[in-house]
Structures are given as structure tokens and as C-alpha cells.
Interface confidence: low
């Protein structure tokens, strides 16, 4: 519908609280270095303007697009050039180029200090003193560190964050109540951010068709009783929502997401029997619940796929008439029958089917040519199955920390040019696949594992894109979205890599390691392991294990010593010498 004033339309649809929160998220995701107070000021100005438009849609500037209004507001920031450098050049452009320019300057790894959690009493005091500012600060800090965070979902996180403080700041043991809740929100938030980052990368790097294919497969697994036309409608609407959010159109995105949740709940009889509980919840919880809902049961007596997609004489005719619709139907039919497959595997099968039809429908005898197409699927299915089986066995044998270390060594040898912090972060996340997925029965392992790995490898791809250092990473990241994981799996040791010069400073540790949390201490040790492999890429597992065991013993010994700093200095030198000898450095 055409509205005289887009800003008034969205303000009325979303309400003042959500409007202000979403504008704050949008601004913080664009100008990631700006102080909180500056953003609050900008948001208040936009909100006051929106209210004038609600009162009179014909008022001056109320007919301007949201991009124009928000872009003009962002471009009033006085320190734009000093803080953001060339991003300031965006302000010389007209819409829509200006918004595209802002989008291109979003930084997946902004140079921001780590968020340090204050004492519980300090947080509770701040929460009680000014609840509104406290919650705005949460939105701001998350949004600027995660510039692609799914904005309507961040509103849901903020609601849970508020609920945690409301409950726990009154509890007898505030810390025991609050800290586990904050840990859970942090971990879920990181996972949510990474999942959304993959959706945006899919849309921005591979286009709408790639995203729609992903959505057809996933929604068909989730709603196997829904008709193809119903799934197609949901896919179109979901694509619009994510295109908007990934494009910085957060007000439209949140509004359309609410409409989609409403539609799904009004039509749940023709979509899924699992939606009842979700649809009884308030809006933010409802949308979150629908997005996470379990797969519905498969309809009984689904006919064989071969009849329509291999045996029929009309395959090429149907394909030629509407290629994407026919391939969409194939993907829908295959996915609803296979909740046990990962989405990326289903997309590989659809791609193989498409390639076969492209070739065979131009052949002298098309039917004979594509008759055995389903046989080509077997190796594609077996590859991830075998890989998951092997890695779950390794995980069960080693436990999470040592499994992460095995992956650290594996990936450092594959792509040693990648920065150490990125290798540590990505390998630690890859290693979490074990605890996350290996506990599941066979039928749930592959969708859990391979689709999770797609999310983690996308983190590697977006971090690497900022500072490309490895042609191998660029190749695996850009050639095919669905083949990223097989591409990385297939990489062998990089024989062209020139080992890093040995630097004793890299392996010098101090007493501060003793006061770190277990997680932080692991990261220190894993950082050292990556550096070791970069120095000695040909080191065997046994050599690396021996050095790491010595290192763990050294840290434990010095942390128990009376004079810790002296111990680290003296024993550290011995450890470095012993390690050099053991690895032949």
C-alpha cells in the first residue's frame, strides 16, 4: 500500500517503544564507533519528527523515504570523517547509493573493547536507577558489535534481558539467579548473530535465488504437510523480511515479520500442527517460537519421487516451461521427505538434478540420459554422513577442548595465512559441533552438524573478506555457498606456505594467565598452538601434543608457585628451548 508518510506508517504500526528501539539498532549498526549518547540524541530527534508526521502526514519532509530521513540524520554527525574515514564519502551520494554505501562499510569485526560484565550489584543499581537507559545501552552495545543482528529478534533478546534483571535483582542470591541467565543470553545471542550473518551473506553475495532455495528446503522440512503453494508463499514473504533486515530497512523488516507471524498463525491448519503453542504467545515470543519450531510429522504414504522427477515423460517439458518452479517443486518434495538431511545437502542434490536436466533435456534421448540421476545422489549423501561419523567418534574420544585443538591444527595447516585470532575463534566454534550435535540420534545429526558448520564457516568467510590473505579461503567462500564445507574439508596442507619466523615473545607468558577464567586460559593455550603450527606446519600430532602437555604443566606449576612472575620468566625460557628442540625449530 502507498502511504503518504512512510515514517508515520511505521511509527503507528510498530508503536513508539519498538520504533525507538529499532531506529537505535539501525543507527548503531551503521555508525558502530559513535558514543551511546550521540545515538540516543539522534534517535530522539527522529522520534520527535515521526510524531509530527503522525499528527499531520502532509507536514514538511514527512513524504521522504526512510533511507533519506535516516541517512540525512546520520550525515549530521560532526565527527564522521575523523571517526569513519572514507565512510563520510557516502554522505555525498544520493539515495539509494548512499544507503548501499553505508551497508558496504558495516564492519563484522569492529575495533571495539570487549564487553566486561560489571559486578551484579553494580548492574542491578544501574538497572533500578534508569531502566530505560540500561536497556537501550544493551541494544546499542549488541547492535554495534553485530551489525547484521536480526533486529526484531534483538528486541526479543532485550525483553528477556529486562526480565532477567527484573527477577534477579530482587532475589536473595542475585548472582546465582542472574549470571546463568546472562551467560545463556550471551551464547544464544552469538549463535543468533552468526545464523543471521549467513542469511545476509547468502542474499548479498549469492542473490535472492540462493536464499529462496535455502528457505524452500528448510520450510519444507519444517512444514512437510503444507502444500507447495503455501511453502512458496511463506518463502516469498520470508525472503522479503530478510532482504529488508539485511539491507538496513529495520522498521519495514520488523513490521513484515509481525505480519508473517500473524499470517502463519491464522493459517496454521494448512501449515503445521506444531504451531499451536507458539501462536498463543505475545508477538516477539511468537515470532521467535515459530522460527525455532520443531519439524511437523511427515504425511503418511508420500509417493516415490521418481514418478514425477525421473520416470515421467514430461520431465523436460515441465522443466522447460518454468525451470525455477519445477526445481522448487523438486526441492520441496525431496526436503519434506528428508528431515534427516542437512539443508545444504538438499541444495546440492537439487543442483545435481538441475545440472543433469540442463544436459539431458538437450540430448537425443533425454529420458535415457536422466534415468539414473538419483544414483548420482548416493555419494553426495554418503560424504557428510561419513564425515560426521568420523568426527563424532573423534569428539567422543577427545572431549570438546582437545577436539577443538585437533581442528585448530587441521585448519591452521589448511589455511596458515589466516590471522591467529580468526583461526582460534573459528576452530573453537567448529569444535562446538561435537557437544551440540553428536548427542543426537543418527536422524538428527546431519541437519544439526552440517547446517551449523555452514554458519561457522560463514564467520570465517566474512572475517576473511575484510582482509583477504588466502586465495584458498576466497575460493571456498565465493565459488559455491552450498559447497563451502566440502571445499574446506577437501583442502590439504598448504605446501606453498613459508613457515613463520620463530618469535620467543609469542611464547612468553605472565602471571596474569592464572587469574583468567578457564575459557580465557584455553584461548591463550590455543593461540599458542596455532602459532606453533604456523612456525612448524610439518609438526606431527604427537610432537604438538607433547609440547602442549608440557605447556599445560608449566602453567599449572607456575600458577601454584609463590613467586609466579619469576617462575613464568625462568620456566618459560626452559619451555621455549625444550619446545624448539622437540620441534626442530
Amino acid at each position: 500500500d502507498a502511504h503518504k508518510s512512510e515514517v508515520a506508517h511505521r511509527f503507528k504500526d510498530l508503536g513508539e517503544e519498538n520504533f525507538k528501539a529499532l531506529v537505535l539498532i539501525a543507527f548503531a549498526q551503521y555508525l558502530q564507533q559513535c558514543p551511546f549518547e550521540d545515538h540516543v540524541k539522534l534517535v530522539n530527534e527522529v522520534t520527535e519528527f515521526a510524531k509530527t508526521c503522525v499528527a499531520d502526514e502532509s507536514a514538511e519532509n514527512c513524504d521522504k523515504s526512510l533511507h533519506t530521513l535516516f541517512g540525512d540524520k546520520l550525515c549530521t554527525v560532526a565527527t564522521l570523517r575523523e571517526t569513519y574515514g572514507e565512510m563520510a564519502d557516502c554522505c555525498a551520494k544520493q539515495e539509494p547509493e548512499r544507503n548501499e554505501c553505508f551497508l558496504q562499510h558495516k564492519d563484522d569485526n569492529p575495533n571495539l573493547p570487549r564487553l566486561v560484565r560489571p559486578e551484579v550489584d553494580v548492574m542491578c543499581t544501574a538497572f533500578h536507577d534508569n531502566e530505560e537507559t540500561f536497556l537501550k545501552k544493551y541494544l546499542y552495545e549488541i547492535a554495534r558489535r553485530h551489525p547484521y543482528f536480526y533486529a526484531p529478534e534483538l528486541l526479543f533478546f532485550a525483553k528477556r534481558y529486562k526480565a532477567a534483571f527484573t527477577e534477579c535483582c530482587q532475589a536473595a542470591d542475585k548472582a546465582a539467579c542472574l549470571l546463568p541467565k546472562l551467560d545463556e543470553l550471551r551464547d544464544e545471542g552469538k549463535a543468533s548473530s552468526a545464523k543471521q550473518r549467513l542469511k545476509c551473506a547468502s542474499l548479498q553475495k549469492f542473490g535472492e535465488r540462493a536464499f529462496k532455495a535455502w528457505a524452500v528446503a528448510r520450510l519444507s522440512q519444517r512444514f512437510p504437510k503444507a502444500e507447495f503453494a503455501e511453502v512458496s508463499k511463506l518463502v516469498t514473504d520470508l525472503t522479503k523480511v530478510h532482504t529488508e533486515c539485511c539491507h538496513g530497512d529495520l522498521l519495514e523488516c520488523a513490521d513484515d515479520r509481525a505480519d508473517l507471524a500473524k499470517y502463519i498463525c491464522e493459517n496454521q491448519d494448512s501449515i503445521s500442527s506444531k504451531l499451536k503453542e507458539c501462536c498463543e504467545k505475545p508477538l516477539l515470543e511468537k515470532s521467535h517460537c515459530i522460527a525455532e519450531v520443531e519439524n511437523d510429522e511427515m504425511p503418511a504414504d508420500l509417493p516415490s519421487l521418481a514418478a514425477d522427477f525421473v520416470e515421467s515423460k514430461d520431465v523436460c517439458k515441465n522443466y522447460a516451461e518454468a525451470k525455477d518452479v519445477f526445481l522448487g517443486m523438486f526441492l520441496y518434495e525431496y526436503a519434506r521427505r528428508h528431515p534427516d538431511y542437512s539443508v545444504v545437502l538438499l541444495l546440492r542434490l537439487a543442483k545435481t538434478y538441475e545440472t543433469t536436466l540442463e544436459k539431458c533435456c538437450a540430448a537425443a534421448d533425454p529420458h535415457e540420459c536422466y534415468a539414473k540421476v538419483f544414483d548420482e545422489f548416493k555419494p553426495l549423501v554418503e560424504e557428510p554422513q561419513n564425515l560426521i561419523k568420523q568426527n563424532c567418534e573423534l569428539f567422543e574420544q577427545l572431549g570438546e577442548y582437545k577436539f577443538q585443538n585437533a581442528l585448530l591444527v587441521r585448519y591452521t595447516k589448511k589455511v596458515p595465512q589466516v590471522s591467529t585470532p580468526t583461526l582460534v575463534e573459528v576452530s573453537r566454534n567448529l569444535g562446538k559441533v561435537g557437544s551440540k550435535c553428536c548427542k543426537h540420534p543418527e536422524a538428527k545429526r546431519m541437519p544439526c552438524a552440517e547446517d551449523y558448520l555452514s554458519v561457522v564457516l560463514n564467520q570465517l568467510c566474512v572475517l576473511h573478506e575484510k582482509t583477504p590473505v588466502s586465495d584458498r579461503v576466497t575460493k571456498c567462500c565465493t565459488e559455491s555457498l552450498v559447497n563451502r564445507r566440502p571445499c574446506f574439508s577437501a583442502l590439504e596442507v598448504d605446501e606453498t606456505y613459508v613457515p613463520k619466523e620463530f618469535n620467543a615473545e609469542t611464547f612468553t607468558f605472565h602471571a596474569d594467565i592464572c587469574t583468567l577464567s578457564e575459557k580465557e586460559r584455553q584461548i591463550k593455550k590455543q593461540t599458542a598452538l596455532v602459532e606453533l603450527v604456523k612456525h612448524k606446519p610439518k609438526a606431527t600430532k604427537e610432537q604438538l601434543k607433547a609440547v602442549m602437555d608440557d605447556f599445560a604443566a608449566f602453567v599449572e606449576k607456575c600458577c601454584k608457585a609463590d613467586d609466579k612472575e619469576t617462575c613464568f620468566a625462568e620456566e618459560g625460557k626452559k619451555l621455549v628451548a625444550a619446545s624448539q628442540a622437540a620441534l626442530g625449530l
Epitope: 539509494p96 547509493e97 548501499e100 554505501c101 558496504q104 548479498q204 553475495k205 549469492f206 542473490g207 535472492e208 535465488r209 540462493a210 543442483k351 538441475e354 545440472t355 540442463e358 565465493t478 565459488e479 559455491s480 555457498l481
Partner: nanobody, 115 residues
Framework: QVQLVESGGGLVQPGGSLRLSCAAS????????MSWVRQAPGKGPEWVSA????????RYAESVKGRFTISRDNAKKTLYLQMNSLKPEDTAVYYC????????GSQGTQVTVSS
């Protein structure tokens, strides 16, 4: 209906140049990254080069780096590939695709490099 129509191919001597064009219609061209892909006789498709939606970020296969230049004109909804210092091994059907896909949705244009 998405349509991609390539042109500009032909027969050229080794060391020569060609400029390929790809006219797009049926989708919001300026919103999508685009790629050039080629397929030599009897071989699978090979990704050649890619450009992001705004034209700022370009990527090339190792085999064409320094010789080929990808560009786009969003106003004209057209993708280009300037090919210099052509070699016999560049002989192939060249086609453009949306995103980084190597799936062929168009006829392509034949490039033959031969003396």
C-alpha cells in the same frame, strides 16, 4: 522472468582483446553480485570473475588475474568483462550468472582464441 543475454564473443588471435557484455532484465540488477563463468569444450563450468552489487569489490580466478577486468553499469543493467592478452586456453563459452553461481541460465557467448 530473469533474463541474461551475453554478447561480444568471437574469434581472436592469441594476445588479442575482447569485451563481453551481459544485458540483464527481470530482476533488480543493482541489488545482486554478478559473476562471469566459462565452459570449455568437454569440461565443467569454471568460475572466472565476480563483482559485488555496488561494483567496489571484484574477484578473479588465478588463471585470469591481471588480464581480465570485470565491471558493471547498474543504470544500464549491464555486466562487462574486458579480456586482454588472450590465450588459447581461454577458449570457451562465457556466460554471466547472478551471485557466485556457476549454474547456466543463459546461452552464453563463444570466445575462440586461435592463430
Amino acid at each position: 522472468q530473469v533474463q541474461l543475454v551475453e554478447s561480444g564473443g568471437g574469434l581472436v588471435q592469441p594476445g588479442g582483446s575482447l569485451r563481453l557484455s551481459c544485458a540483464a532484465s527481470g530482476f533488480t540488477f543493482g541489488r545482486f553480485g554478478m559473476s562471469w563463468v566459462r565452459q570449455a569444450p568437454g569440461k565443467g563450468p569454471e568460475w572466472v570473475s565476480a563483482i559485488d552489487s555496488g561494483g567496489a569489490d571484484t574477484r578473479y580466478a588465478e588463471s585470469v588475474k591481471g588480464r581480465f577486468t570485470i565491471s558493471r553499469d547498474n543504470a544500464k543493467k549491464t555486466l562487462y568483462l574486458q579480456m586482454n592478452s588472450l590465450k588459447p586456453e581461454d577458449t570457451a563459452v562465457y556466460y554471466c550468472t547472478i551471485g557466485r553461481s556457476t549454474s547456466r541460465g543463459s546461452q552464453g557467448t563463444q570466445v575462440t582464441v586461435s592463430s
